[in-house]
């Protein structure tokens, strides 16, 4: 599922870029894609450790 077209608005009024769960916003293609395509943090089993700042997945980012 993709985001609908933005409404026209001024340059100083940024439009939101929401993504559905399990999708993340790709800054280069400028639309939502499956998070797995973007090397996003992956949820891990309880007790697993990681060297990266792996917070809860935030698909809208």
């Amino acid at each position: 599922m993709r985001r609908g077209p933005r409404s026209l608005r001024g340059r100083d009024a940024p439009a939101p870029t929401p993504c559905v769960p399990a999708e993340c916003f790709d800054l280069l293609v400028r639309h939502c894609v499956a998070c797995g395509l973007l090397r996003t943090p992956r949820p891990k089993p309880a007790g697993a450790s990681s060297p990266a700042p792996r917070t809860a997945l935030q698909p809208q980012e």
Epitope: P14, P16, F25, L27, L28, C35, G36, L38, R39, A52
Partner: antibody
């Protein structure tokens, strides 16, 4: 843990060509964006370009006509083909992975030196 | 392209000093999704850069608490609250909001006084 290893640097004459390689381990290059960043001696960092999970490429506009990024997914390796090299292309070339949630360069290779000189 | 301007270009400081580096962008770095993709890297001679701070103020894993980032819009700051011997390096700000291209500041070299 993702690791990147560059190779292919060296001395090349002005007008010549060179291909750099970046071998990735610990992650597949079919996910994410895989970048080249260069640093001229004593200078700052300059983004060269990248190749995406789909094989799409993006370039620094100042370099696009001379530099080409490609990949071989079977080798989990991506490349930087540099043509019509100039003295000002002398730099350490780093490959780097991009975090797709926060959009920072989260993993870097060790760098490979390219010297363009006659 | 977005221009990133750091100041100062270099500074001399002593161990224990508080150090502040500023970074100014030519346009606001607030993305239409509400996020500000401004990051800070540390680089030591002969080594690849390392991420310190992401999205303005978030310390990367393993980065000491003496490093902090702040700012908004076009003006950002990296602060080292108490400079340690291992902190002598060059620091770069970088933006990923308006891409391509990804752009970096020219760097700030922190030297021993």
């Amino acid at each position: 843990e993702v690791q990147l290893v560059e190779s292919g640097g060296g001395l090349v004459q002005p007008g010549g060509s060179l291909r750099l390689s970046c071998a990735a381990s610990g992650d597949s290059i079919t996910s994410g964006y895989w970048n080249w960043v260069r640093q001229a001696p004593g200078k700052g960092l300059e983004w060269v370009g990248n190749i995406s999970y789909s094989g799409s490429t993006y370039y620094n506009p100042s370099l696009k006509s001379r530099f080409t990024i490609s990949r071989d997914t079977s080798k989990n390796t991506f490349y930087l083909q540099m043509n019509s090299l100039r003295a000002e292309d002398t730099a350490v070339y780093y490959c780097a992975g991009l975090d797709g949630l926060y959009w920072y360069f989260d993993v870097w290779g060790q760098g490979t030196l390219v010297t363009v000189s006659s | 392209d977005i221009q990133m301007t750091q100041s100062p270009s270099s500074l001399s400081a002593s161990v224990g000093d508080r150090v502040t580096i500023t970074c100014r962008s030519s346009q606001s770095l607030v993305h239409s999704n509400g996020n500000t993709y401004l990051h800070w890297y540390q680089q030591k001679p002969g080594k690849a850069p390392k991420l310190l701070i992401y999205k303005v103020s978030n310390r990367f894993s393993g980065v000491p608490s003496r490093f902090s980032g702040s700012g908004s819009g076009t003006d950002f700051t990296l602060t080292i609250s108490s400079l340690q011997p291992e902190d002598f390096a060059t620091y770069y700000c970088s933006q990923s909001t308006h891409v391509p291209p990804f752009t970096f500041g020219q760097g700030t070299k922190v030297e021993i006084k």
